[in-house]
């Protein structure tokens, strides 16, 4: 699982790439995306 902290501090990533990784994680974990 990828934590929000890890994602937000992953430098050099586009905002869409962060959304992409969040969404892929959401599809697996069913966390709320809002």
């Amino acid at each position: 699982a990828v934590s929000e902290h890890q994602l937000l501090h992953d430098k050099g990533k586009s905002i869409q790439d962060l959304r992409r990784r969040f969404f892929l994680h959401h599809l697996i974990a069913e966390i709320h995306t809002a």
Partner: antibody
Framework: QVQLVESGGGVVQPGRSLRLSCAAS????????MSWVRQAPGKGLEWVAT????????YYPDSVKGRFTISRDNSKNTLYLQMNSLRAEDTAVYYC???????????WGQGTLVTVSS | QLVLTQSSSASFSLGASAKLTCTLS???????IEWYQQQPLKPPKYVMD???????STGDGIPDRFSGSSSGADRYLSISNIQPEDEAMYIC?????????????FGGGTKVTVL
């Protein structure tokens, strides 16, 4: 190894319904989001629907929203696509696909052909 | 509007290097995309995801002859020492989540012929 086998395709008249199935094996089905992607004869790919691992969240493009419903039965390791009010433009090979932690459509089935014609 | 543009076809000599281009709509130039290979009469196969900085992760069973790179809104798929089995349609795709809705679009694909 990951295996996805689609079934349920065939010839159907415009306005009628059809339900596709995708039998999954070789992985823990309940742990991954699943999708349907279609390809009209001689045309490109079009994303049709996505469902989360437990089935709580579903996503559709405007072209099928309100007509198609994606669902899953994790006890049967099976993904479904209920297609209502079918149109000629829905004629396509329908593929099911499995996500990974890295990408949306990492593994694909062989596809099932749906022909909408009177 | 999220759009991917690909040239329709390209031909390469056996053993040559090939470079295919997928261009994002200008306002989406930072986006991560995916590349897929579809051999004739077969389902698509995931090749790689390709980020803005050119970093990429390849799918299962993809030879290391396949690599990716990026420049601005362009995303490149390179094939070194191209082989007969590489003759296929190569399709790029991109997804995004907007207001809790998911969208995913594919490019039209580039048909690669190996001479």
């Amino acid at each position: 190894q990951v295996q996805l086998v689609e079934s349920g395709g065939g010839v159907v008249q415009p306005g009628r319904s059809l339900r596709l199935s995708c039998a999954a094996s070789g992985f823990t089905f309940s742990s991954y989001g699943m999708s349907w992607v279609r390809q009209a004869p001689g045309k490109g790919l079009e994303w049709v629907a996505t469902i989360s691992s437990g089935g709580s969240y579903t996503y559709y493009p405007d072209s099928v929203k309100g007509r198609f419903t994606i669902s899953r039965d994790n006890s049967k390791n099976t993904l479904y696509l209920q297609m209502n009010s079918l149109r000629a433009e829905d004629t396509a090979v329908y593929y099911c696909a499995r996500q990974t932690t890295m990408t949306y459509f990492a593994y694909w089935g062989q596809g099932t052909l749906v022909t909408v014609s009177s | 509007q999220l759009v991917l543009t690909q040239s329709s076809s390209a031909s390469f000599s056996l053993g040559a290097s090939a470079k295919l281009t997928c261009t994002l709509s200008s306002q989406h130039s930072t986006y991560t995309i995916e590349w897929y290979q579809q051999q004739p009469l077969k389902p698509p196969k995931y090749v790689m995801d390709l980020k803005q900085d050119g970093s990429h992760s390849t799918g299962d069973g993809i030879p290391d002859r396949f690599s990716g790179s990026s420049s601005g809104a362009d995303r490149y798929l390179s094939i070194s020492n191209i082989q007969p089995e590489d003759e296929a349609m190569y399709i790029c795709g991109v997804g995004d989540t907007i207001k809790e809705q998911f969208v995913y679009v594919f490019g039209g694909g580039t048909k690669v012929t190996v001479l």
